[in-house]
Every structure is written in C-alpha cells, then in structure tokens.
Interface confidence: medium
C-alpha cells in the first residue's frame, strides 16, 4: 500500500549541508553555489509510530538510492548508519523500528529523535566535514535542522 512521501534537503542550524561522502556515510559541510547540488535529498516517509502534537514518526531515505538512515547498537552505543534495503519492499508504512525517527518541530527548526533510542538525535559536529551521527544532545553537538522542500 503506498505511503505518503515528501522530499527535503536538510541543513543544520549552522547552515551546513549534508552530502554523501562514500557509499554509506553522510557528512556535514558548508557548500557554495557551485557544489550546492551535492547535498542529498531525503525522501521522508510517514510511517508506523505514535504521532502526537509535537512528534511525527518518519523514515528518512536518500532519494534515488536504496539507502535509509537507521539506528543500531554498536559497542554499547546507539549508532547512526546508512542501510541498504530491498527497493521492492521499501518504503512501507510499517518500517522496522531502527528506521523510525520522531520528527520534532521546535519553532522554525526540526529535530529527529531515534524511536529505537529515545533522547538520541541525528546530530552534526561543529567542525566541518565530520560524519552525521547519533548523539544524546550533549556538549556542542547540533541537533536542530531546517528543512527545504523539494518538488517530487
């Protein structure tokens, strides 16, 4: 059964863009006019979870690729990864928990909390060219993003 999908570019609150740096890693960096088209476009699917006034369960795929952000436990720490999926089966309204994020809108910004690991968020570092990761909102890490809609 088809599910609702919208397409977005994400930038962190420092205006760093997200780019695919190798087959399975996202990095955050500032892009200028010439290479702005390097930033990834996310396919946001509205999936199984518990929606509320301030949280909407979504899955985040990379448009045109069979890759989804997922959250898994590695060496005792919740970890963000890009996971390859079967394009015949994904996206679906009932995604495995590791693919589900609670999209939380805070003023004009948005945060993405792991459904599998509450209080862990998609995060970027202050520094340039660092991987996007799953953080627990500590220190200087950035968890607030802006979403730019992209026509399908």
């Amino acid at each position: 059964v088809p599910i609702r999908q919208l397409h977005y570019r994400l930038r962190d609150e420092q205006q760093k863009s997200l780019v695919l740096s190798d087959p399975y890693e996202l990095k955050a960096l500032h892009l200028n006019g010439q290479n702005i088209n390097q930033q990834v476009i996310f396919s946001m699917s509205f999936v199984q979870g518990e929606p509320s006034n301030d949280k909407i369960p979504v899955a985040l795929g990379l448009k045109g690729k069979n890759l989804y952000l997922s959250c898994v436990m590695k060496d005792g720490t919740p970890t963000l990864q890009l996971e390859s999926v079967d394009p015949k089966q994904y996206p679906k309204k009932k995604m495995e928990k590791r693919f589900v994020f609670n999209k939380i809108e805070v003023k004009s910004k948005v945060e993405f909390e792991s459904a599998e690991f509450p209080n862990w968020y998609i995060s970027t570092s202050q520094a340039e060219h660092k991987p996007v990761f799953l953080g627990n909102n500590s220190g200087q890490d950035i968890i607030d993003f802006t979403m730019e809609s992209v026509s399908s």
Epitope: V1, P2, F46, G49, E50, K94, K97
Partner: antibody, heavy 119, light 107 residues
C-alpha cells in the same frame, strides 16, 4: 464515535463466492486503512487484507489468489470477496480500521459476521 | 510467512500478575500489539506499539518487546480480565496474529 457495521450472506455452498460489506460511520474515511480479519470457530484470528481510500490493497499471501477487497468512498464502504470457498473458510469475518494514531493497527472493529460454508 | 507463538493457556489467581508471551523471529525489531477477546465479542486493542495503552484500558495492562519475545503483563489481575489474548505484528507488508492465549482467572 466511529462505528463499523457489516453485512453479507451467512450461508454458502462450496465453490461459491463470499461477499461482505462494511460501512463506516463517523470519522474520516480517507485517513485510514480498512481491513478484513476472520476467525474460524474456536480458533485464532487470521488477517485477510487491507485497502486504503484510493483502492490500493495488501493481501495475506495464503489467500491472495482468491481475495478481492474493494472500496466505495462515496458511501464510506469497503467490501470483501472470497472466491471458491470451502468448509475451511467457515469463520466469523470482521472488518476493522487501521489508524495512524495507534501505529497503524486495528483500533475499531465491526461486530463480526458468521459465514458458514456447507453443502 | 512469519509465525508468532503464544502459550495456549495461562492461569492466574485474582490479584496476582499474569504474563503472556509471544515469540517470533526478531519480533523485537518490529512493533507488537495485543488484543483481548471475550466470548462472542469482537477483539479489543489493549496494547499498541509494544507498550502503549489506548484510552480506556486500565493501567494494570502493560507490554514490552525485545529480542524474539513480546510480553503482555496484567498486574493485579481481575476476574473480568479472563479472556483470549492475541499478539499481533507484521511481516513485510502483511499482518500476523499469534495463535492466542486463554487467560483463566482462578477461583
């Protein structure tokens, strides 16, 4: 308050086609998925399939070749058709709503219709 | 096709805690749901998304799900909790119910 009211023939002969309809009263029709489930006498529940308002369907693989679920949005109704029935299809058939607010699970059910297949 | 396995029956004394299990391959990767069904009635959702309670369901009902097992726990079990309980999950695009557990409240 949401209500699901279902009806259809209760007694069939082997090889006939089972037809049931479920009407939805209260609440939006387009925001949900609509499902059919059955329960043979004294046994457990079996999911048959689902449909959304646009007519997109999902079926249980074990029944897929015999099942058709359709929707009539103008009447807020959806229907089940099961062809070539046998005694093994004797069951109480339920219609139900799958809601996003409960994680796309079945939160409202019809009253059930007992369908008996007998020669 | 996925299989969800439940014990056929569980007995508990009034006021005690009843635990009903549901096992399936990597069930903890998915969301589990629980339904209560009394004789002659349609099923009623009692737990959704592993551990959430719909409005109107008493606090004594709780759920958990990890590894290969989801568990429905009824604390302070009452006579009116006597019923069949079904777990429910999904496999790829289709839904799967467990075989059901008959909960008997003794006495």
């Amino acid at each position: 308050q949401v209500q699901l009211q279902q009806w259809g023939a209760g007694l069939l002969k082997p090889s006939e086609t089972l037809s049931l309809t479920c009407a939805v009263y209260g609440g939006s029709f387009s925001d949900y998925y609509w499902s059919w489930i059955r329960q043979p006498p004294g046994k457990g529940l079996e999911w048959i399939g689902e449909i959304d308002h646009s007519g997109s369907t999902n079926y249980n693989p074990s029944l897929k070749s015999r099942v058709t679920i359709s929707v009539d949005t103008s009447r807020n109704q959806f229907s089940l058709s099961l062809s070539s029935v046998t005694a093994a299809d004797t069951a109480v058939y339920y219609c139900a709503r799958a809601s996003p607010s409960s994680g796309w699970t079945l939160d409202y059910w019809g009253q059930g219709t007992l369908v008996t297949v007998s020669s | 096709q996925s299989v969800l396995t439940q014990p056929p029956s569980v007995s508990v004394s009034p006021g005690q805690t009843a635990s009903i299990t549901c096992s399936g391959d990597k069930l903890g990767d998915k969301f589990a749901f629980w339904y209560q069904q009394k004789p002659g009635q349609s099923p009623v959702l009692v737990i959704y998304l592993d551990n959430k309670r719909p409005s109107g369901i008493p606090e004594r009902f709780s759920g958990s799900n990890s590894g290969n097992t989801a568990t429905l726990t009824i604390s302070g079990t009452q006579a009116l909790d006597e019923a069949d309980y079904y777990c429910y999950a999904w496999d790829n695009a289709y839904e799967v119910f467990g075989g059901g557990t008959k909960l008997t409240v003794l006495g």
